[in-house]
């Protein structure tokens, strides 16, 4: 006959490990007892349990309550045991010794491997601002046994660097993602992906990128100067810019205070029916926590009567 076992038994931390040991004997052979021991190199054998065909299971005090026989029905040639709630300290070599009649004794070894799944964490880097050089966007750390794999999933262009720290029974892996911040990255996801044999599926942590920027400011509304004439209603100037964080807008007049009746509504400056009083230089001031921008325009309110008079003069001059 011969013993059937596994070379390596792999179990996730906290789960139960089956330590297999099955005697494949010839017809009529019987198993008298099975002794299980831990036999790590350089250390003496430590008894786990003894399975006796007549007297049942005896578990050594060190493993009391943690070692069981399989539930019935049990094949009398099956010397497997169950190690409940595996911990990292259980990782190592185990041996089963089977006493059979009439064939004698057999022994087999297996290695128990306890996987410790990682609990990854993602830490965003310093605030990202447009114009910076290569900057840390985020770092992701995962510790487990064996060492986990840490990668990044993103559409954003960047570079990664990884480092590993080995501990006595595990390894911590940290991966950093660096990029050159640009406004196009705003709102883009940056996902840390952690793979490990103890995980049923990859663990993913997503960080949304925020890049501070402020676009150049411009003013819309003066495209057709001829519309800016005395008496016109609904005239307005709109300040155009964009930024992250969203900017605030402020309107001033360079050559004096804003005329009475002019309404400031965020990025928009609304005028009452136009008079020559509204002529002047207007400044839109755009700012956020990152930067500030100005844009100025000159409003020249036309007097239609003056214009027509001028035209007549010109005609008569010709």
């Amino acid at each position: 006959g011969e013993l059937e076992t596994s070379d390596v038994v792999t179990v996730v931390l906290g789960q139960d490990a089956k330590l297999p040991c099955f005697y494949r004997g010839d017809s009529g052979e019987q198993v008298g007892q099975v002794a299980w021991a831990r036999v790590d190199a350089g250390e003496g054998a430590q008894e786990l349990a003894l399975l006796h065909s007549k007297y049942g299971l005896h578990v050594s005090p060190a493993y009391e309550g943690r070692v069981e026989q399989p539930p019935p029905p049990r094949n009398p040639l099956d010397g497997s045991v169950l190690l409940r709630n595996a911990v990292q300290a259980d990782e190592g070599e185990y041996e089963c010794r089977v006493s059979t009649f009439p064939a004698g004794s057999f022994q087999a070894r297996l290695r128990l491997r306890v996987l410790v799944p990682p609990l990854p964490s993602l830490n965003p880097g310093p605030a990202l601002e447009e114009g910076q050089g290569l900057t840390l966007a985020a770092s992701c750390t995962a510790e487990g046994s064996p060492a986990p794999s840490v990668t990044w999933d993103t559409e954003v262009k960047g570079t990664t660097s990884s480092r590993s720290f080995k501990h006595s029974r595990s390894a911590a892996v940290t991966s950093e993602f660096h990029l050159v911040p640009s406004r196009s990255m705003n709102g883009q996801p940056l996902t840390c992906v952690v793979s490990h044999p103890g995980l049923l599926q990859d663990q993913r942590i997503t960080h949304i990128l925020h890049v501070s920027f402020l676009a150049e400011a411009s003013v819309r509304g003066l495209e057709d100067q001829n519309l800016w004439h005395i008496g016109r209603e609904g005239a307005m100037l709109k300040c155009l810019s964009e930024g992250q964080p969203p900017p605030s807008y402020n309107w001033t007049r360079l050559d004096g205070p804003l005329p009475s009746g002019v309404r400031v509504d965020g990025d928009t400056l609304g005028f009452p029916p136009l008079t020559t009083e509204h002529s002047g230089i207007y400044v839109c001031h755009v700012s956020n926590e990152f930067s500030s921008r100005d844009s100025q325009v000159t409003v020249d309110v036309l007097d239609p009567q003056e214009d027509s008079g001028k035209q007549v003069d010109l005609v008569s001059a010709s």
């Epitope: 076992t5 596994s6 089956k18 019935p72 029905p73 040639l77």
Partner: antibody, heavy 123, light 107 residues
Framework: QVQLQQPGAELVMPGASVKMSCKAS????????MHWVKQRPGQGLEWIGA????????SYNQKFKGKATLTVDESSSTAYMQLSSLTSEDSAVYYC?????????WGYGMDNWGQGTSVTVSS | DIQMTQTTSSLSASLGDRVTISCRAS??????LNWYQQKPDGTVKLLIY???RLHSGVPSRFSGSGSGTDYSLTISNLEQEDIATYFC?????????FGGGTKLEIK
Amino acid sequence: QVQLQQPGAELVMPGASVKMSCKASGYTFTDYWMHWVKQRPGQGLEWIGAIDTSDSYTSYNQKFKGKATLTVDESSSTAYMQLSSLTSEDSAVYYCARWGSTMITWGYGMDNWGQGTSVTVSS
Amino acid sequence: DIQMTQTTSSLSASLGDRVTISCRASQDINNYLNWYQQKPDGTVKLLIYYTSRLHSGVPSRFSGSGSGTDYSLTISNLEQEDIATYFCQQGNTLPWTFGGGTKLEIK
């Protein structure tokens, strides 16, 4: 995927015997035990016994010893149950069910069941 | 033999309800308690093994708990497809024995 195929029905005479089959596919037959369960019309489930398909070791419910005989044919991945000296009490649906006691797994529940064979004992 | 008792033979509930089915063993069964679902067409499936472990492919609305002699199966959010008979089974001592079953119906 794992499948256990059983014939739908068997009609047998009182006093006779019947041998029903359970053909396994989708897994390594000899890695798992095969259990047999009886269900009388409108009744609960009753465990008959089980066979270790790797070496034909059997374990029976005392109540069915002498009534049921469990065997396997490794070459066709088929488990069999023979019922002898049939009476009306043996009229029931008989299920075969796989039990996950393998080299690496622990046998807990019967994780795959056949559709059942309905046995009617009648003259 | 260990007797398994499911005191409620039939149970009526509404869709979306939380339903609990209990099972009692005549002696300690060391958590070797499994739950099976039998559909009206006779199909049998394993739901829960070793008291509380969800069999692969079984919806997470099914859960099991208990210890010693008292065990229960809970369906947290009853769906139409859960209409079936539920059996408990002990695997601690031979012969294996089953509860009488609890038939679940829709109100």
